[in-house]
């Protein structure tokens, strides 16, 4: 029960990619507003997105303080124009989110192939080290900085003339693969965190093929 015409938020859902983290919920407000609070399991509640009519709240600034912590959020519902009003229990209606551990749960963003270079029968493929919103010593950390060797990349590569995808893996951002002389190859990469049980893979990078601008060919 709560104040007349005030309903509790529901379907609280974390949407997070490369640590950019937004809490979403329902319903679209009718004569009510929302405030979000976030806390670690052992910490104090911090209020965000005060008296908003949105049904989402960007909590990135809070979760990047320690991405290995487990966070809980809650969404308070208030009557529009009367935010001091409380429910029958003496406090506003609220709903808890599921727990969220960014390090284990943030989705891996789509990677990008930065470059590839062929030297004879070897090709070096480099994956862009994407910047995150996680900070250390006032600088933004890359995905590799945050995950270290927990993050690997799987390279799919194939001759332009065939469909079978060979694979290679690296725990850096570079691959060195053997190719057949005189053949053009295409490449796509996928970020993977094998130690996870869910959200292990990113979507595939855009496909890049030899003979396009990103690559360089050198005959040795």
């Amino acid at each position: 029960s709560g104040t007349t015409n005030t309903v509790a938020a529901y379907n609280l859902t974390w949407k997070s990619t490369n640590f950019k983290t937004i809490l979403e919920w329902e319903p679209k407000p009718v004569n009510q507003v929302y405030t979000v609070q976030i806390s670690t399991k052992s910490g104090d509640w911090k209020s965000k997105c005060f008296y908003t009519t949105d049904t989402e709240c960007d909590l990135t600034d809070e979760i990047v303080k320690d991405v290995k912590q487990t966070y809980l959020a809650r969404v308070f519902s208030y009557p529009a124009g009367n935010v001091e009003s409380t429910g029958s229990a003496g406090e506003p209606l609220y709903e808890n989110s599921p727990e969220f551990t960014p390090y284990l749960e943030t989705n891996l963003g789509q990677p990008t192939i930065q470059s590839f270079e062929q030297v004879g029968t070897k090709v070096n493929v480099t994956v862009e080290d994407e910047r995150t919103l996680v900070r250390r010593n006032n600088t933004f950390l890359s995905l590799r900085d945050v995950f270290g060797k927990d993050l690997i990349y799987t390279l799919y590569y194939w001759k332009s003339s065939s469909s079978g995808k060979k694979t290679a893996k690296t725990n850096t951002n570079e691959f060195l693969i053997d190719v057949d002389k005189g053949e053009n190859y295409c490449f796509s990469v996928q970020a993977v965190i094998p130690s996870r049980t869910v959200n292990r893979k990113s979507t595939d990078s855009p496909v890049e093929c030899m003979g396009q601008e990103k690559g360089e060919f050198r005959e040795i």
Partner: antibody, heavy 120, light 107 residues
Framework: EVQLVESGGGLVQPGGSLRLSCAAS????????IHWVRQAPGKGLEWVGY????????YYADSVKGRFTISADTSKNTAYLQMNSLRAEDTAVYYC?????????????WGQGTLVTVSS | DIQMTQSPSSLSASVGDRVTITCRAS??????VAWYQQKPGKAPKLLIY???FLYSGVPSRFSGSRSGTDFTLTISSLQPEDFATYYC?????????FGQGTKVEIK
């Protein structure tokens, strides 16, 4: 508990077709890779091919290329091996296996296998 | 394709014996080598991964090592349940390839 269960094996005539299924439980196949490996009677292990169920990418051994097709239905958490133009030398126990996908660990869980006999 | 040449193809040993099986890769595979145990009518089971790491639940009498492109599986003290066929496998490149297998029999 991670489990892989193959089904669909049986007796088929040369030139015939068969579809094997690999039903997974205890994990989501799109988070991993699924391989098929076969073993002819009294022989060693031979890799057949793999699929990444997340994007549908596949690769096949030369011995089956153009005849076998691996697919996956992520809604059913099941991978398939479609075998066409079967030959006597395809007679084997067919296993599906999960690829953990790290640099260190490859095939960590295997199914119990299903026997395919190609004979007239 | 990378060839994995496994030896011996079979061996006879007694309970308590130290048993060594080797695999040679035809080119560099780094440490991307696994060892599997297979008993008749059963699926292979992972024993060793990344050349030398013991997989969860595998007895410590099993060990693996690498020297360049040579890989070794050692059973320090053979137990009755260890009589089986053992396979090495490389997963450094596609296609992954297996050794021919080593059957460990009772002497």
């Amino acid at each position: 508990e991670v489990q892989l269960v193959e089904s669909g094996g049986g007796l088929v005539q040369p030139g015939g077709s068969l579809r094997l299924s690999c039903a997974a439980s205890g994990f989501t196949i799109s988070d991993y890779w699924i391989h098929w490996v076969r073993q002819a009677p009294g022989k060693g292990l031979e890799w057949v091919g793999y699929i990444d169920p997340y994007n549908g990418y596949t690769y096949y051994a030369d011995s089956v290329k153009g005849r076998f097709t691996i697919s996956a239905d992520t809604s059913k958490n099941t991978a398939y091996l479609q075998m066409n133009s079967l030959r006597a030398e395809d007679t084997a126990v067919y296993y599906c296996a999960r690829d953990y996908g790290s640099l260190e660990v490859s095939l960590d869980y295997w199914g119990q296998g299903t026997l395919v006999t190609v004979s007239s | 394709d990378i060839q994995m040449t496994q030896s011996p193809s079979s061996l006879s040993a007694s309970v308590g014996d130290r048993v060594t099986i080797t695999c040679r890769a035809s080119q560099d595979v780094n440490t991307a080598v696994a060892w599997y145990q297979q008993k008749p009518g059963k699926a292979p089971k992972l024993l060793i991964y990344s050349a030398s790491f013991l997989y969860s639940g595998v007895p410590s009498r099993f060990s693996g090592s690498r020297s360049g492109t040579d890989f070794t599986l050692t059973i320090s003290s053979l137990q009755p349940e260890d009589f089986a066929t053992y396979y090495c496998q490389q997963h450094y490149t596609t296609p992954p390839t297996f050794g021919q297998g080593t059957k460990v029999e009772i002497k």
